[in-house]
């Protein structure tokens, strides 16, 4: 906290400029005002502040604004917005996209901190939902931060958000994650046809139930290895060997080097090995010649 | 054959909430995608959200935003809309819609439950 | 906000051909679905993905998809075909139908 003390004689600030970096923390306190300082908060970012003297700064504009500082104030806070504290920007409310790319570009380059996560979630409730801008913006700058997100919060991405999302933004998703924006996704490209759909839904089928791969398996994508071994193995054990050929197309062959993993493992498991040797890729381990399978999950189903 | 049972006709006060239920009958209603739509009197249809057969993602026409609410319970085979904060306009008929014709891209709703009217009225 | 544009009615003589036009920016580009609805009734649905026809559909319904129009085509009008006709598609986050256009057999 910085004393209060008179201004010496001459040295009012008329201005925000560089003459203020040789001010002391308590002549900046006595002598720059505060509403000067918002209205000229865009020249901040060009003089070299010392982090003490940014302090300085920060106090008068929390002194001018204790509900909260206006966005006009905001979108320019620049490097202070590192000294804020997520308490501080609680009271904001940010509605422009400008303000909040503005704000990320300070943190460049950095960890999500604690202040750019709230400062994310203030925007998106302002918004109500996670907007396409809004979320091209983020995983601009954050890659990972659709998966960041818990299956509730999800939940409120429109589809049309989903034609911003790589294939990269989604690496670090849970299955949880995939159930909850697989079928946006789905809505998303339902107007596209075979293998246009089948590029775009990709990232996203490991939140494919069994139906969908089986509609798939009709269609001739030639889905490959990398992404077959992502499928919830829930979803991949039901299909029969002669739909995992179709789904996979040439890229069936790969199978033999993953069936340790899973879910082929469990996969080659459920299946009968008159009908794996049918792919002559020497899978071994399923279901011998004349035993009998029993599915006691249908039958739970119908008890 | 199929069928999409809904619940009884309900009276709201305007600012109350009512929730609608639609219970499949004859075949496995978990698969499935169940939409909403609506039909005010003399109106045509509008729709207004839809759920995804484990229950886990919903999506919801802009309008009714932050005001419906679907959920589903695959215990017993029922889904639910909830709309909060009625005014007399929601005055409509409210359907539920299964999409059970498969394929990869196709979400066309071809079983329908047989509506159930609610009216708000002070 | 996207909209789909259909005639308020349309009428046609049994045995004729019923035509009913859905319009809407780059429809084509889309699906397009088509309803049936009698009075104090569920909608039925009659074509989807533009051509396609349900199980139970008769034979003369069909549709067509491009540029900006979708059309369902009733050949062959039967008095059963009398009802509210509804088209729709998905645009951006949002399923629309269209105005609803009531078909009339003479």
């Known amino acids: 906290e910085v004393e209060k003390t008179a201004c010496p004689s001459g040295k009012k600030a008329r201005e925000i400029d560089e003459s203020l970096i040789f001010y002391k923390k308590w002549e900046l306190e006595a002598c720059v005002d505060a509403a000067l300082l918002a209205t000229q908060m865009d020249r901040v970012n060009a003089i070299p502040f010392t982090y003490e003297q940014l302090d300085v700064l920060k106090h008068k504009l929390d002194e001018l604004y204790p509900q909260g500082y206006p966005e006009s104030v905001i979108q320019h806070l620049g490097y202070l917005f590192l000294k804020m504290s997520p308490e501080d920007i609680r009271k904001w409310n940010v509605t422009s996209l400008e303000t909040l790319k503005a704000l990320l570009e300070v943190n460049k380059g950095h960890e999500m901190s604690p202040q750019v996560a709230t400062l994310i979630d203030r925007f998106v409730k302002g918004r109500g939902q996670l907007d396409k801008d809004t979320l091209d913006t983020l995983t601009a700058f954050y890659p990972g931060y659709l998966c960041s997100l818990s299956p509730e919060e999800l939940s409120s991405v429109p589809p049309s958000s989903i034609w911003a999302v790589r294939p990269q933004d989604l690496d670090t998703c849970d299955p949880r994650q995939l159930d909850v924006l697989y079928p946006k996704a789905r809505l998303a490209f339902q107007n596209m046809n075979g293998s246009e759909y089948f590029v775009k839904i990709q990232s996203f089928l490991g939140g494919a139930p069994t139906e969908d791969l089986k509609a798939l398996s009709q269609q001739n994508v030639s889905m490959d290895l990398a992404t077959f071994m992502k499928l919830r193995t829930d979803a991949v054990l039901p299909l029969t060997v002669a739909e995992v050929q179709k789904l996979l197309g040439p890229h069936v062959e790969g199978l033999k080097a993953e069936e340790r993993h899973r879910p082929v493992r469990d996969w080659i498991l459920r299946q009968r090995q008159d009908d794996l040797d049918t792919l002559g890729l020497g899978l071994q381990g399923g279901i011998p010649n004349g035993y009998l399978v029993l599915d006691l999950s249908m039958q739970e189903a119908l008890s | 054959e199929v069928q999409l049972v809904q619940s009884g006709a309900e009276v709201k006060k305007p600012g109350a909430s009512v929730k609608v239920s639609c219970k499949a009958s004859?075949?496995?209603?978990?698969?499935?995608?169940v939409h909403w739509v609506r039909q005010a009197p003399g109106q045509g249809l509008e729709w207004m959200g839809i759920?995804?057969?484990?229950?886990?993602?919903?999506t919801y026409a802009q309008k009714f935003q932050g005001r419906v609410t679907m959920t589903r319970d695959t215990s017993t085979s029922t889904v639910y809309m909830e709309l909060s904060s009625l005014r007399s306009e929601d005055t409509a008929v409210y359907y539920c819609?299964?999409?059970?014709?498969?394929?990869?891209?196709?979400?066309?709703?071809?079983?329908w439950g047989q509506g159930t009217l609610v009216t708000v009225s002070s | 906000s996207y909209e789909l544009t259909q005639p308020p009615s349309v009428s046609v003589s049994p045995g004729q051909t019923a035509s009913i036009t859905c319009s809407g920016d780059k429809l084509g580009d889309k699906y397009a679905s088509w309803y049936q609805q009698k009075p104090g009734q569920s909608p039925v649905l009659v074509i989807y993905?533009?051509?396609r026809r349900p199980s139970g559909i008769p034979e003369r319904f069909s549709g067509s998809n491009s540029g900006n129009t979708a059309t369902l085509t009733i050949s062959g009008t039967q008095a059963m075909d009398e009802a509210d006709y509804y088209c729709?598609?998905?645009?951006?986050?949002?399923?629309?139908f269209g105005t609803g256009t009531k078909v009339t057999v003479l």
């Open positions: 993905q533009d051509n």
């Open positions: 729709q598609a998905w645009d951006s986050d949002t399923y629309v």
């Open positions: 004859g075949d496995t209603f978990n698969r499935y995608y």
């Open positions: 759920i995804n057969p484990s229950g886990v993602s919903t």
């Open positions: 819609a299964e999409s059970r014709i498969p394929g990869y891209n196709n979400f066309a709703m071809d079983v």
